[in-house]
Interface confidence: low
């Protein structure tokens, strides 16, 4: 069965720093999402070989990619406190397969000692299903937007 290997399990970084998240699969996928989990999960990026990556506007200009969709390293730059959270890779195959998640802890530089990662990987056993529909915010040219749950006029 298809699996997604994701690393690191957890990382603590100061505000303004960068973090690398690597998503590896055995191939045979159509594309890969990086999804920020939480009460309202958000798709951060969609990456597909041969296609210009789509990045959520909150991370526009702060994401770099290296490798291919089968072994993708996503670099998030200029991290902010609000970027703290668990990020999971989702491989789009015949079925959707999730990685184990990466907990990113963004801290004020002087408080790093109080916030450290434990050795245990984040749990990925209860990941939410992708939401449907989308809400339309203020116009922004070619803005890539996550889809919060919302009713849709079409099936």
């Amino acid at each position: 069965a298809q699996e997604v290997q994701q690393s690191p399990h957890c990382t603590t970084v100061p505000v303004g720093a960068s973090v690398n998240i690597t998503c590896s699969t055995s191939g045979g996928l159509r594309g890969i999402y990086l999804r920020q989990l939480g009460p309202q999960p958000q798709d951060i990026i969609y990456y597909e070989d041969g296609v210009v990556p789509t990045t959520d506007r909150r991370f526009r200009g702060r994401i770099d990619f290296s490798g291919s969709q089968d072994n993708l390293t996503i670099t998030m730059h200029r991290l902010q406190l609000s970027d703290t959270g668990t990020y999971t890779c989702q491989a789009i195959t015949e079925v959707n397969v999730y990685g184990s998640g990466t907990l990113v802890l963004v801290t004020e530089e002087q408080s790093q000692g109080w916030h450290r990662c434990s050795d245990a990987p984040p749990r990925a056993s209860a990941l939410p299903a992708p939401p449907t529909g989308s809400a339309l915010p203020d116009p922004q040219t070619a803005s890539a937007l996550p889809d919060p749950p919302a009713a849709s006029a079409l099936p």
């Epitope: 990026i45 959520d56 890539a144």
Partner: nanobody, 123 residues
């Protein structure tokens, strides 16, 4: 990056017609679901029409039989022919695409859209 730019909006009297166009660039246009959205001030967003890569269209009930969505994969363009326009069609119209599983309009996640073009229909 993905770029979408709508054109063709304007003012028209009820019963008139307009044709919206949306050239796309920055990605493999033919691989993805496309659609037209609209939103009037103070009103809910409405998906007017979507079109799969095999050119299968889906329409909102409110525009069925009056609007026709089409795509030109060779020229990376999306169109919306709007006939028999009504005052309630007045809105900002947005061209949109959804990144995700290729082909299907049923797996839509990251939405990309243009700045919009205003359509105003007067009595």
């Amino acid at each position: 990056d993905v770029q979408l730019q709508e054109s063709g909006g304007g003012s028209v009297q009820a019963g008139g017609s307009l044709r919206l166009s949306c050239p796309a660039s920055g990605y493999t246009f033919s691989h993805y679901c496309m659609g037209w959205l609209r939103q009037a001030p103070g009103k809910e967003r409405e998906e007017v029409a979507t079109i799969d890569t095999d050119s299968t269209p889906t329409y909102a009930d409110s525009v069925m039989g009056r609007f026709t969505i089409s795509r030109d994969n060779a020229n990376n363009a999306l169109y919306l022919q709007m006939n028999d326009l009504k005052p309630e069609d007045t809105s900002m119209y947005y061209c949109a695409t959804w990144m995700g599983l290729r082909g299907s309009c049923h797996d839509r996640r990251l939405e990309v859209r243009g700045q919009g073009t205003q359509v105003t229909v007067s009595i």
